[in-house]
């Protein structure tokens, strides 16, 4: 892959260990936690990133859902099981044999059960709504400028194809970025919207996953865009299966 040959590092993932032990002495990088080889020319999958971050503190949230089927990552961090391609395994279990099913971004989509719980397939998250609230500014941002700035960011920094940024909505102080990517739309080599959203979330929080690239200073026409709250909603191709008890709680 294209890890920097000079110092053998992974530009797209700082949570790696790299050494020149690949074919022909090429730099090869492996994700912490899993030891899996990663492609440093693109984003690392969220599953491998979460696995590398397993020792980080829990980051629980309780959010309002924009629709009855939208999921929010209320469970926070956990040590996931990833498949050989680095994707989340459909069934995740903790060390006390409590199991649950997750979607392609690793968010729980069923009630928790025991080892007998079956998760037949990894259900794809095809629609992600990133809901941001920015700090007060002298005036509202120009919607067109804001739209262009965010689309450019996702294209240049996260290498997400522009067609997957469905819309950018703005009603001061709330910005909503809609990412959409059906299974049929995602070609080989395309960045996954779940991975792009995760890198963006970490950038916004000042926790960049990139190696030696510095952070992100968001601006629109010279005006700093400082995010004070981030909520992310996930919609799956197949609605989640929770008991009525949870839905009415």
């Amino acid at each position: 892959h294209t890890a920097a040959q000079d110092n053998c590092t992974c530009p797209t993932n700082k949570m790696t260990v790299c050494s020149p032990d690949g074919p022909g002495g090429r730099c090869q990088c492996r994700a912490l936690g899993s030891g899996m080889a990663v492609d440093c020319s693109t984003l690392t999958s969220k599953c491998l990133l979460l696995k590398a971050r397993m020792s980080a503190p829990k980051n629980a949230r309780t959010l309002v859902r924009p629709s009855e089927h939208a999921l929010v990552d209320n469970d926070g961090l956990y040590d996931p099981d990833c498949d050989p391609e680095g994707r989340f395994k459909a069934r995740q279990c903790n060390q006390t044999s409590v199991c649950w099913c997750v979607n392609s971004v690793g968010v729980r989509r069923t009630d928790k059960g025991d080892l007998s719980l079956r998760c037949d397939e990894l259900v794809r998250t095809h629609h992600i709504l990133i809901d941001l609230r920015h700090r007060p500014t002298a005036g509202a941002f120009n919607h067109s400028d804001l739209d262009a700035e965010l689309r450019r960011l996702f294209r240049e920094r996260y290498r997400l194809h522009p067609k997957f940024v469905a819309a950018v909505h703005y009603e001061q102080p709330t910005i909503q970025i809609e990412l959409r990517q059906n299974t049929s739309q995602k070609a080989a080599g395309d960045v996954d919207i779940g991975d792009a959203a995760y890198y963006f979330e970490r950038d916004i929080k000042g926790e960049s996953l990139f190696q030696g690239r510095g952070g992100l200073d968001l601006r629109v026409r010279g005006e700093p865009l400082q995010v004070e709250r981030t909520l992310i909603y996930y919609l799956d191709e197949i609605p989640p299966k929770f008991s009525m008890k949870r839905l009415t709680a």
Epitope: E149, R152, L153, E156, R157, F210, R213, G214, G215, L216, D217, L218, R219, V220, R221, G222, E223, L225
Partner: nanobody, 129 residues
Amino acid sequence: QVQLLESGGGLVQPGGSLRLSCAASGRTFSSQSMGWFRQAPGKEREFVSAISWTGANPTYADSVKGRFTISRDNSKNTLYLQMNSLRAEDTAVYYCAADTSGGSYYYERATAETSYDYWGQGTLVTVSS
């Protein structure tokens, strides 16, 4: 309209140091992200270093990391590049560039030539014994 004027180039021995300056005029300097690029004889122009409006988040090409330091003085409308431990392969014409769009600053944007809308005429740096 922005005018950029580089200075400080010259002949230096390997291991030596130089400090390049870029004086900007014509628009509010503090609202621009700035960069240094270079072009060696017979080669493409390449990114060297960049810095945001505030002076935070400096970015460097791998080939100059630890040797070059970018800085800016907004009160003097001037961008600097301190070059230490110079090598023969650092020989090039060094260009100062400004991004006046007021857009975001991040590595992928700062390192791309197409992000910059104003360029200086360049100053020649020759590293030779």
